[in-house]
């Protein structure tokens, strides 16, 4: 049924043409888990290529996905996250290339949302705090945040701050004066489920005031 | 049919190693880790570590970190547990043991005895 | 590390009756409705035989006598049906951190 070879040294011999990449998405809608499946080459022709997942499933032994556009999706409640699925492109029925995964290794978490930044004139500080869907989740709560940011000048210069809190302060001594900067945060699971970091959130942009002297400073 | 087939018995003197194998067949071996458990004389089951044949990585538990490497060879199938340093209290059954998912054990080879004795 | 409790150490039980194996954990080896705790039975001179997984998801090929049950810290092995070839030693084993623990055993002898 996998249609691969069981041999050790013919197992790479599934057509390289029709490798895929996939992640799930746990509680995404509801109760309900995700899996969204795409073919690495984008130019794949997949006129008649299906995808389908057995094992590892509830009161059903395999469940077909559903195609939208380029990309191939089950929405579900029955993945018994426990255990190998077997996900195979297929034509006609036959297998043309599998891979056995455990859903919970390629969990990709939803974007952060509601970023934002508010200064503290008396504390000379940013405070950045942002919002997760996962702290209402029952199976993946547990996330590691990574909170990027730059001057809006520096194209490529993002500085990164791994937290799991959804709150950060950044200390104004230790960006620009008078500058405009841009800050984003993604999230990737970090207890017990594995995966892929999450998109991005979209962008806040914030501006740091100038240097107040204290009295009698002279400004260089 | 789904195999792992261990190799025999080793009998060594404290201080040495011993390179334990443990060859699968009957699945595509980059599909499932492989760990090894080990059960002292009269005694219950110890998680040692696992690797993964598709990469190569691997996990040990803490207890025998330094004292164990696990390899593997993709070509033959096959994947390897070092024990170094060898000391009495190493003389135990040795099991590989495919893991079916994170991280229970569903198939088992059929043990290798190390012997560990001056 | 989780420290796995396995009651009781042996157990004797006629053959046709019920034997129940008790495992209680140090901390929960459960993420909402996933439980990672699983069984198995070794008998002497062989490798241990995977029963369960996943609390209560019986392994392919396993007589259906054997079931399994529980969440967080308390699991439980039952055999509904004693047959004579159950006996053995049975293993708890959790899986939700590292290092991967087992509980101590519990010895099934026929009464």
């Known amino acids: 049924e996998s249609g691969y070879a069981q041999n050790g040294d013919l197992e790479d011999a599934e057509l390289d043409d029709y490798s895929f990449s996939c992640y799930s998405q746990l509680e995404v809608n509801g109760s309900q888990h995700s899996l969204t499946c795409a073919f690495e080459d984008p130019d794949v022709n997949t006129t008649n290529l299906e995808f389908e997942i057995c094992g590892a499933l509830v009161e059903v032994k395999c469940l077909s996905f559903r195609k939208l556009q380029e990309i191939y999706f089950i929405e579900t409640k029955k993945f018994l996250l426990i255990g190998k699925s077997n996900i195979c492109v297929k034509v006609g029925g036959k297998s043309l290339t599998c891979k056995k995964i455990d859903l919970t290794t390629i969990v990709k978490p939803e974007a952060p949302f509601d970023l934002s930044v508010i200064y503290r004139e008396g504390a000379n500080d940013f405070v950045v705090t942002f919002n997760t869907s996962h702290l209402q989740k029952k199976y993946v709560k547990v996330l590691m945040h990574d909170v990027a940011y730059r001057q809006e000048k520096d194209e490529n210069k993002w500085m990164h701050v791994n937290l799991s809190s959804t709150k950060l302060t950044l200390l104004q001594r230790n960006l620009q004066p008078e500058a405009m900067y841009e800050i984003k945060v993604r999230s990737i699971p970090d207890h017990y489920f594995k995966g892929f970091w999450s998109e991005w959130s979209p962008s806040y942009y914030f501006r740091t005031p100038e240097i107040n002297n204290s009295p009698g400073e002279m400004d260089p | 049919q789904v195999q792992l087939v261990q190799s025999g018995a080793e009998v060594k003197k404290p201080g040495a190693s011993v390179k334990v194998s443990c060859k699968a067949s009957?699945?595509?071996?980059?599909?499932?880790?492989l760990h090894w458990v080990r059960q002292a004389p009269g005694q219950g089951l110890e998680w040692m570590g696992g690797?993964?044949?598709?990469?190569?990585?691997?996990a040990y538990n803490q207890k025998f970190k330094g004292k164990v490497t696990l390899t593997s060879d993709r070509s033959t199938s096959t994947v390897y547990m070092e024990l170094s340093s060898l000391r009495s209290e190493d003389t135990a059954v040795y099991y590989c043991a495919r893991s079916g998912g994170r991280w229970y054990f569903d198939v088992w080879g059929q043990g290798t005895t190390v012997t560990v004795s001056s | 590390d989780i420290v796995l409790t396995q009651s009781p150490d042996s157990l004797a039980v006629s053959l046709g009756e019920r034997a129940t194996i008790n495992c209680r954990t140090s901390e929960s080896v459960s993420i909402h409705l996933l439980h990672l705790m699983h069984w198995y039975q070794q008998k002497p001179g062989q490798p241990p035989k995977l029963l369960i997984y996943?609390?209560?998801n019986l392994e392919s090929g396993v007589p259906d006598r054997f079931s399994g049950s529980g969440s967080e810290t308390d699991f439980t092995l039952t055999i509904s049906s004693l047959q004579a070839e159950d006996v053995a030693v049975y293993y708890c084993q959790q899986s939700i951190k590292d290092p991967y623990t087992f509980g101590g055993g519990t010895k099934v002898e026929i009464k």
């Open positions: 690797i993964d044949p598709k990469t190569g990585g691997t």
């Open positions: 009957g699945y595509r071996f980059t599909d499932y880790e």
């Open positions: 996943g609390a209560s």
